[in-house]
């Protein structure tokens, strides 16, 4: 659809004649009578196909023709058209003398033709126009002429339409030619798709408008490309939806069992040497000198009463030092000089001489110890604590500090592992002699039933359209993460896509 | 009183050129689209090359397109005809024409002969 | 290309005879037709144009009918010096095409 425009510019007739000599009275009042139609090999009498147009009375003999466009006049003369353009045509332009007012063929006498041209012409549409000039022996008509395509038509034969739009259905304006020209923010045949913000995760993030970035289930961040872990997942990470892939040092379900106490609670002190033992379970090392579960306390090198026959234990910096009683002599004064005639025993102890006199023994009472029986018995040195348990000295009897996890008088009863209740799932379950054992219900295995093995809510295949399913283990349900064109909880629904020409 | 006259015309060997002119008085030459039309001996009439009235359109029949080149001076009231790689087949009398049935224009020339021979 | 066959390719008659020729276009060609006489070493001359309009200048007694595919040139009383060689043209579309030409010659 367009129009071809004609623009009439000057039309000399100056004797004042008819087409057949004869003079206008008084003067030839000139008005113009135009033809449009389909370009023929030669011009031929006919209909005019693409379209007739007449003008009012424009001037008399000699005149030039004011152009009326912005005043909503007739000149230039518009010929409209709905069709393709076909690039040719020919054009029949006839200038009239009108006696009178009535101007209509059927009122005019044959003779009152002034003049008349019929061209071939070639003609591209959007051309700037075109100039040309017929002239006769009596006339000299001179005008202007061109194609132009109607609103939302365009390409070279306006046959193109474009309307422009930014609505449901698209959001573009036309270029020349006639294709689209999306406004910013979006794309697609019909820029109807939104251009998500950049970097948006093409799987895993949408838009429903331009720079914007919604994630679809199961991922998050703001350019959706971090995956929702595990609800209740403590020390772990996803690589997709709602895993829990635990960190170094931690484990269960919900990588909340701590399996790494060593490293996130550094319990040894004084430089002691830690190694897991088990969940939140440890075991410290100490450096010389120093004691306690966790090496907390500090110990004195005299602590174990290294001097023997009554020696006394002066602590140095690098050690220690005996200082013997008369008699007795070396590191520990443990070489006598005495005789059971010196009366060497302490606290009641019998002597017994032995090599010839040259030495003795003491046989000491209970609660008494040592080789002259000098010290009183230490109940810790025989170790008599369990699993670890420190031993302490409490005036004549000792008691036992248990290691977490262990009870009774000498550490050597197990707090039940299953206090804790450790089993997931609903899990039985039962105390071992070295750690426990879960017995788990139907649809779920692994040390700590923490593995489902049967109920698989993904095994259905409940989501359509090639949509990817993920089981959300802790409430046995799934989620569907829909491909781009599809909405639902099972992605059942197309989005709403557009006929195939929208306007 | 309108007048047409071709000329140019002559005996040329095959694959040669030549070329025809018109020269057109007694109307308004730049008006009217011109034709080219020749009649071999004793043959009918073919049309040959159009162009028109301002030049900007031009048509060639088939046989003859890319070898012929149909042209026009409105400023001197003449039509021309190029014509190279001529052939055999071309051999004919060549008329130029005024046509606009539309008009009641109908001018033609008495032709030229033009003889391709070896 | 738009083929006009015209027939008959020739004709016998006699002064003051009514002689009829064809012409029929292989598509539509509306009127934009013409008929054409010509004598030997002549120019063709122009008879009717646009199917049925006689040219000034040119005798009552040719007239032209027809539109579309099928065309008529009928001569109502033959003159002596009618008999001559009639061509048809179509104007519609290039390339231009002929009919093959009628000779009407003496009986």
């Known amino acids: 659809s367009g129009v071809f425009q004609l623009q009439l510019q000057e039309f000399i007739n100056e004797r004042g004649v008819l087409a057949s000599g004869r003079p206008c009275e008084p003067g030839c009042r000139t008005f113009f009578r135009v033809c449009l139609k389909h370009f023929q090999a030669v011009v031929s009498p006919g209909p005019c196909t693409f379209g007739t147009v007449s003008t009012p009375v424009l001037g008399t003999n000699s005149f030039a023709v004011r152009d009326d466009s912005s005043g909503g006049g007739r000149n230039p003369l518009q010929l409209p058209f709905n069709f393709t353009w076909p690039g040719t045509f020919s054009l029949i332009i006839e200038a009239w003398h009108a006696p009178g007012d009535d101007l209509r063929p059927e009122a005019l006498p044959p003779d009152a033709l002034i003049s008349k041209i019929a061209i071939q012409g070639s003609l591209a549409v959007g051309q700037n126009w075109l100039l040309d000039e017929q002239t006769s022996t009596l006339t000299r008509l001179r005008y202007s002429y061109r194609v132009i395509c109607s609103d939302n038509y365009y390409g070279d034969n306006c046959s193109r339409l474009c309307k422009k739009r930014n609505d449901h259905f698209g959001h573009y304006v036309c270029q020349p030619d006639g294709n689209l020209s999306c406004l910013p923010g979006w794309t697609g045949e019909y820029c109807q798709q939104p251009i998500c913000l950049s970097g948006c995760h093409e799987q895993n993030g949408y838009c429903s408008k331009p720079a914007e970035c919604l994630c679809r289930p199961g991922w998050q961040g703001r350019l959706c490309n971090e995956c929702i872990p595990h609800n209740g997942c403590r020390h772990g990470t996803c690589s997709t939806p709602w895993q829990c892939t635990c960190d170094e040092g931690w484990g269960g379900l919900f990588c909340d069992q701590d399996l790494n106490y060593c490293t996130h609670h550094s319990p040894c002190k004084n430089g002691a040497t830690c190694s897991n033992s088990g969940q939140r379970s440890y075991t410290c090392t100490c450096r010389p000198g120093y004691t306690g579960v966790d090496c907390e306390l500090e110990l004195s090198e005299c602590d174990s009463n290294p001097c023997r026959n009554g020696g006394s234990c002066k602590d140095q910096e690098d050690g220690y030092h005996c200082l013997c009683p008369p008699g007795y002599y070396g590191l520990h004064c443990e070489h006598s000089t005495l005789s059971c005639a010196d009366s060497p025993c302490f606290n009641g102890g019998s002597c017994r001489e032995r090599n010839q006199g040259a030495n003795y023994a003491c046989e000491c009472p209970p609660n008494f110890t040592g080789s002259n029986c000098e010290k009183k018995v230490d109940r810790c040195t025989s170790n008599p604590c369990a699993n670890g348990g420190q031993c302490l000295n409490r005036g004549p009897s000792r008691m036992c500090r248990c290691r977490p996890g262990f009870t009774g008088t000498y550490c050597e009863l197990h707090v039940s592992d299953c206090a804790r209740n450790p089993c997931a799932h609903g899990g039985t379950c039962h105390d071992l002699e070295n750690g426990l054992m879960c017995t788990c219900p139907a649809g779920f295995s692994g040390r700590r039933c923490e593995v489902r093995t049967s109920i698989d809510a993904c095994a259905s295949s409940p989501c359509f359209n090639r949509a990817t399913c993920y089981t959300d283990l802790s409430t046995d349900t799934f989620v569907c993460n829909c491909p781009y064109g599809f909405v639902g909880s099972r992605c059942e629904f197309p989005v709403g896509l557009p006929p195939s020409f929208p306007w | 009183e309108v007048q047409l006259v071709e000329s140019g015309g002559g005996v040329v060997q095959p694959g040669r050129s030549l070329r025809l002119s018109c020269a057109a008085s007694?109307?308004?030459?730049?008006?009217?689209?011109m034709y080219w039309i020749r009649q071999a001996p004793g043959k009918g009439l073919e049309w040959v090359a159009f162009?028109?009235?301002?030049?900007?359109?031009?048509y060639y029949r088939d046989s003859v397109k890319g070898r012929f080149t149909i042209s026009r001076d409105n400023s001197k009231s003449t039509l021309y005809l190029q014509m190279n790689s001529l052939r055999a087949e071309d051999t004919a009398v060549y008329h130029c024409a005024a046509l606009n049935w539309e008009l009641g224009i109908d001018y033609w020339g008495q032709g030229t002969m033009v003889t391709v021979s070896s | 290309d738009i083929q006009m066959t015209q027939s008959p390719s020739s004709l016998s008659a006699s002064v003051g005879d009514r002689v009829t020729i064809t012409c029929r276009a292989s598509e539509d060609i509306y009127s934009n037709l013409a008929w054409y006489q010509q004598k030997p070493g002549k120019a063709p001359k122009l008879l009717i144009y646009a199917a049925n309009r006689l040219q000034d200048g040119v005798p009552s007694r040719f007239s032209g009918s027809g539109s579309g595919t099928d065309f008529t040139l009928t001569i109502s009383s033959l003159q002596p010096e009618d008999f001559a060689t009639y061509y048809c043209?179509?104007?519609?579309?290039?390339?231009?095409?002929f009919g093959q030409g009628t000779k009407l010659e003496i009986k």
């Open positions: 007694g109307f308004t030459f730049s008006n009217y689209g």
């Open positions: 043209l179509q104007g519609s579309k290039f390339p231009l095409t």
């Open positions: 162009i028109s009235h301002g030049g900007g359109i031009t």
